[in-house]
């Protein structure tokens, strides 16, 4: 048993039929000695009397708030949760699991840029009694501060007869160093509360192997005299670091004509501008990335052609 | 570069960014695999990393691009040393067009640039044996060459904007 | 789910020579490691030998077939192979085509994998 935040604690359980559970002592919070009851939750059903109560928590039905009080008046509470582990892993009931970018991947995290700032995100098909706590840190012998803000429902998308909910969290580096070579990764735990179930889910990462730029911005087409040809130019997104001479971005460009089959053709370049043959009907493209780390992609940025 | 001439700014940009390129091709990213499976992180640590106080920032570049030059040279040394090692010459075998050899002879084009013959900066303490099973070796070039992208992307990003703001 | 389908396996005298293939389903290929195992009735499963593209690229092989054994790999027709010549005797064995995808072949020099086939018989008659 350990203390997750003033009185509320976390009973570890080995999981399985028939499983010996853990035996916790409870005290009661006050200098009284004498005429002391306990309580588990709203039943009025008296547990046991003393200062300290012995239990062994085997099952849901054993957590809960457990409640001291003497002459009909409560003293003191202490909650329990339940966090599980079967076969000897803990267990993930309350998050989805995202499977990208591979299997177990329960918290998923991006950055626009190098400023150490950045945006996680998890799913869970649970609507009610949930509550979320983030922690981040750089490191994790030596942390250095990293502060999260509070958890926001950032969207709820319909899965055939499900519901899901996706749930994000914005994190900044205390002492962020855009220009420096990442030598600790960071680190983000998210304790989930799911009724009397705890759970903790943890992602470690360095901001270079998260970075996904925004789109390019400012897509212009300028037809040239006499050609079939365009001038294509865009710009850096401004979410992106600065300066761009040292924060470079290199692109990927491509003209998709009406019918999805079409052959596209893909030209990289690490310019803002470019001419290519641009049908009518068609539409041109422009996806950016890290010119020296090959991080994720931005999504595509799109103009039509005609 | 030693004393305070400056490096050949677009020749260090064109071959940073070759060594970029040649870092990801000898070790592509896939998304799946995360090195901190396999345990022991640290393993990695004693490579030589560009810092905060370095001085290859944009505004550290402008003061004085001396410090951040001397640094990325080491870190030069240091990882062509490794690559010419025992980790990448012993078990198992590099496949017979595999990259690492012209990354290993583009490291040491690039420490050069740095330093024409003549002038000589310390350079760091070279790394320990390395490890005796094949399968051990293997995930230390991992380690090495995820490590050397994350340090060359730097290098690279100084000498571009070396070559865009401080050149003759 | 990767699918590894062998084929090549047979009977030969000892001092010939054998071709196996083996076919992946997925395009996960290149960023697998591929490798072969063999197992003999009654023995411990054998490392035989692998191929990578992480880590500047590798190829490896067991004591017992180095030398003689060679693996390659077709990217793009996700197949690898493994040419056996000088066979021996102590050679026959079920001959199986692995795949280790999470951790591009460290696991396959460990002696284990993410994926296996069916295997194929080889039987080296002297």
């Known amino acids: 048993i350990w203390e997750l935040k003033k009185d509320v604690y976390v009973v570890e359980l080995d999981w399985y039929p028939d499983a010996p559970g853990e035996m916790v002592v409870l005290t009661c919070d006050t200098p009284e000695e004498d005429g002391i009851t306990w309580t588990l939750d709203q039943s009025g059903e008296v547990l046991g009397s003393g200062k300290t109560l012995t239990i062994q928590v085997k099952e849901f039905g054993d957590a809960g708030q457990y409640t001291c009080h003497k002459g009909g008046e409560a003293l003191s509470h202490s909650l329990l949760l339940l966090h599980k582990k079967e076969d000897g892993i803990w267990s993930t009931d309350v998050l989805k699991d995202q499977k990208e970018p591979k299997n177990k991947t329960f918290l998923r995290c991006e950055a626009k840029n190098y400023s150490g700032r950045f945006t996680c995100w998890w799913l869970t098909t649970i609507s009610t009694d949930l509550t979320f706590s983030v922690k981040s840190s750089r490191g994790s012998s030596n942390p250095q501060g990293v502060t999260c803000g509070a958890v926001t429902l950032s969207a709820e998308r319909v899965r055939g007869d499900n519901k899901e909910y996706e749930y994000s969290v914005e994190c900044q580096e205390d002492s962020a160093c855009p220009a420096a070579e990442e030598r600790l990764p960071i680190e983000v735990m998210v304790d989930a509360i799911h009724k009397l179930k705890y759970e903790n889910y943890t992602s470690s990462f360095f901001i270079r192997d998260i970075i996904k730029p925004d789109p390019p911005k400012n897509l212009q087409l300028k037809p040239l005299k006499n050609s079939r040809q365009v001038e294509v130019s865009w710009e850096y997104p401004d979410t992106w670091s600065t300066p761009h001479s040292y924060f470079s971005l290199t692109f990927c460009i491509q003209v998709q004509g009406k019918s999805k089959r079409e052959k596209k053709d893909r030209i990289f370049t690490d310019k803002t501008s470019a001419t290519v043959i641009c049908r009518k009907n068609a539409s041109f493209s422009v996806q950016a990335q890290d010119r020296y780390y090959s991080s994720s992609w931005s999504e595509w940025a799109s103009v039509p052609c005609s | 570069v030693p004393g305070g001439s400056s490096p050949a700014w677009a020749q260090c940009q064109q071959l940073s960014q070759k060594l970029c390129t040649l870092a990801w091709s000898a070790h592509p990213l896939v998304g799946h695999m995360d090195l901190r499976e396999e345990g022991d992180e640290e393993t990695t640590n004693d490579v030589p990393h560009i810092q905060c106080g370095d001085g290859c920032d944009p505004q550290g570049l402008r003061d004085n691009s001396q410090f951040c030059l001397q640094r990325i040279r080491q870190g030069l040394i240091f990882y062509e040393k490794l690559l010419g090692s025992d980790i990448f010459t012993g078990e198992p075998s590099l496949l017979p067009d595999s990259p690492v050899g012209q990354l290993h002879a583009s490291l040491l084009g690039l420490s050069q640039l740095l330093q024409p013959e003549g002038h000589h900066w310390e350079t760091q303490q070279i790394p320990s044996p390395s490890p005796s099973q094949p399968w051990q070796r293997l995930l230390l070039r991992f380690k090495i060459l995820r490590s050397l992208q994350a340090f060359v992307a730097v290098a690279a990003r100084v000498f571009a904007h070396g070559a865009a703001t401080l050149s003759p | 789910e990767v699918q590894l389908v062998e084929s090549g396996g047979g009977l030969v005298q000892a001092g010939g020579s054998l071709r196996l293939s083996c076919v992946a389903s997925?395009?996960?290929?290149?960023?697998?490691?591929m490798g072969w195992f063999r197992q003999a009735p009654g023995k411990e499963r054998e490392f035989v030998a692998a191929i990578g593209w992480s880590g500047g690229g590798f190829i490896h092989y067991g004591d017992s077939v180095k030398g003689r054994f060679t693996i390659s790999a077709d990217n793009g027709k996700n197949t690898v192979y493994l040419q056996m010549n000088s066979l021996k005797p102590e050679d026959t064995a079920v001959y199986y085509c692995?795949?280790?995808?999470?951790?591009?072949?460290?696991?396959?020099?460990?002696?284990?994998?993410?994926?296996r086939g069916q295997g194929t018989q080889v039987t080296v008659s002297s």
């Open positions: 997925e395009r996960t290929f290149s960023s697998s490691a």
């Open positions: 692995a795949a280790d995808s999470r951790l591009r072949g460290i696991a396959l020099l460990k002696g284990s994998y993410d994926y």
